[in-house]
Amino acid sequence: LSTGVSFFFLSFHISNLQFNSSLEDPSTDYYQELQRDISEMFLQIYKQGGFLGLSNIKFRPG
Amino acid sequence: SVVVQLTLAFREGTINVHDVETQFNQYKTEAASRYNLTISDVSVSDVPFPFSAQSGAG
């Protein structure tokens, strides 16, 4: 069964940011700003035609 | 630090797992200057199909 889409799980650390409880709440400014920056960054990195997007962003303490 | 976990979606056949990781790693310096994000410990793996069917691509 082929969907025509490949999915990759990606994990990384951001060492110059501190985790706090607002990163567990998608309604907070801190969460939304970080999510926006990360989404924008991935659009920059994978500029080639095959990139479809990202989903399931989760933040955890490092 | 903050650990970020996410799922990336690509058109099938357009990129292999090695290039997903390499292209991300090569962008780390720019991420630091443009977004003030210091990135380390990058890990990439492919998502088995049954999981990816549920997760969709936003």
Partner: antibody, heavy 120, light 107 residues
């Protein structure tokens, strides 16, 4: 037309080093990744690593990371592979091979091969 | 590392025969599978990429198939000029490993 022309055969003593060249023509050298492959006499193919001549980014097969160094000279459109601390098991034909461009996961052009013989 | 197990290691067939070479990967390589043909004393030549796409100039008697971990190269009607060693290659993840090769001869 695309061509990859490699340097000639070499005979080296154990412990010596050798530098093999791969001169590219017929395409824009910096936009294609160059890989190196080993083939010992009568044996199969073994991937050594690659260099992206545009960024000088390299990636090695762990097995070869202390054996080979890959470089590229953009102005000469030439890729190089230097092999160190040669031993008899390094005797092989070494190929350079171009990886196809965006989303092209294959080697579309190969050099003619360079035989490196290690013998005392 | 992904191991590529190719079979058979050698094969003798008659002109006109249908010939099948198999390559098994130790993990899912998502169709990032390449086939090369190498004639004695020559450099390998690209035959098939993305498991089933025939490269320009390769005769239509060659075809590739498979998915996941299991891949096949088929020659529908063997010709004398097909005498060579055939290699599969994983292009999913580094190291980009090759199969050990299948030496094809004419009976």
């Amino acid at each position: 037309q695309v061509q990859l022309v490699q340097s000639g055969a070499e005979v080296k003593k154990p412990g010596a080093s050798v530098k093999v060249s791969c001169k590219a023509s017929g395409y824009t050298f910096t936009t294609y990744t160059m890989h190196w492959i080993k083939q010992a006499p009568g044996q199969g193919l073994e991937w050594i690593g690659y260099i992206n001549p545009g960024s000088d980014y390299t990636h090695y097969n762990q097995k070869f990371k202390d054996k080979a160094t890959l470089t590229a000279d953009k102005s000469a459109s030439t890729a190089y592979m230097e092999l160190y601390s040669l031993r008899s098991e390094d005797t092989a034909v070494y190929y350079c091979a171009r990886q196809g461009n965006y989303a092209a996961y294959y080697f579309d052009y190969w050099g003619q091969g360079t035989l490196v013989t290690v013998s005392s | 590392d992904i191991q590529m197990t190719q079979s058979p290691s050698s094969l003798s067939a008659s002109v006109g025969d249908r010939v099948t070479i198999t390559c098994r990967a130790s993990g899912n390589i998502h169709n990032f599978l390449v086939w090369y043909q190498q004639k004695p004393g020559k450099s390998p030549k690209l035959l098939v990429y993305n498991a089933k796409t025939l490269t320009d100039g390769v005769p239509s008697r060659f075809s590739g198939s498979g998915s996941g971990t299991q891949y096949t190269l088929t020659i529908s009607s063997l010709q004398p000029e097909d005498v060579a060693t055939y290699y599969c290659q994983n292009f999913w993840n580094v190291p980009f490993t090759f199969g050990s090769g299948t030496k094809l001869e004419i009976k």
